[in-house]
């Protein structure tokens, strides 16, 4: 988490920083929604503990053409500390179910709101 | 462009069994994830089963498992969905999709209802 610049300013950004950012662009889109987020796009739902950011960008990932989720992609990809490619999933990342982008999003604001307020930076 | 058009739904009795097909163009559907997705009428999408590219991973909601079989023929560019001891509560207009695009590239559907 020492190179997350280029999303707000241009210096390394402290975890804390980045994380409320993060928050801050999916409470966008999730506010903005008008028509159905990636127009009902289907992704495969996360196990929102240990190498979550990894596997969120891993899911996320795959939607492409969706302009609403490219910022939230690449500030996903500053919490990741390895490249993520499309088709790639991680032994984390376990495929159970699909959900709609737009519930993935929910479910991902909902946790990462609870590891601000718990002060889970990392 | 994407197209996909499903066919084999209709009316069948609890307990029975259907076989739906979507053939698919316009892409290239080898490498291709596939899924389907259903809507109960007055409901949300379902997500119902996913078969990676090489047919070697297949993905199952836990309301179909072990009842349906999602399988691929890439030499004819289709997607099957084999659908066993269907209940009432399949009833739904079932979709194929090609994995991770909108509903504007989905098919119309193809409806299917369970009831006695």
């Known amino acids: 988490l020492t190179c997350l610049g280029g999303f707000a300013s241009p210096g390394p950004v402290p975890p804390s920083t980045a994380l409320r950012e993060l928050i801050e662009e999916l409470v966008n889109i999730t506010q903005n929604q008008k028509a159905p987020l990636c127009n009902g796009s289907m992704v495969w739902s996360i196990n929102l503990t240990a190498g979550m950011y990894c596997a969120a960008l891993e899911s996320l990932i795959n939607v492409s053409g969706c302009s609403a989720i490219e910022k939230t992609q690449r500030m996903l990809s500053g919490f990741c500390p390895h490249k993520v490619s499309a088709g790639q999933f991680s032994s984390l990342h376990v495929r159970d179910t699909k959900i709609e982008v737009a519930q993935f999003v929910k479910d991902l604001l909902l946790h990462l709101k609870k590891l601000f307020r718990e002060g889970q930076f990392n | 462009e994407v197209h996909l058009l499903e066919s084999g739904g209709g009316l069948v009795q609890p307990g029975g069994s259907l076989r739906l097909s979507c053939a698919a163009s316009?892409?290239?559907?080898?490498?291709?994830?596939m899924d389907w997705v259903r809507q109960a009428p007055g409901k949300g999408l379902e997500w119902v089963s996913t078969?990676?590219?090489?047919?070697?991973?297949?993905y199952y909601a836990d309301s179909v498992k072990g009842r349906f079989t999602i399988s691929r023929d890439n030499s004819k560019n289709t997607l099957y969905l084999q659908m066993n001891s269907l209940r009432a509560e399949d009833t739904a207009i079932y979709y194929c999709?090609?994995?991770?695009?909108?509903?504007?590239?989905w098919g119309p559907g193809t409806l299917v209802t369970v009831s006695s």
């Open positions: 999709a090609k994995a991770y695009t909108g509903r504007s590239y």
């Open positions: 316009g892409f290239t559907f080898d490498s291709a994830e």
């Open positions: 078969i990676s590219p090489s047919r070697r991973g297949t």
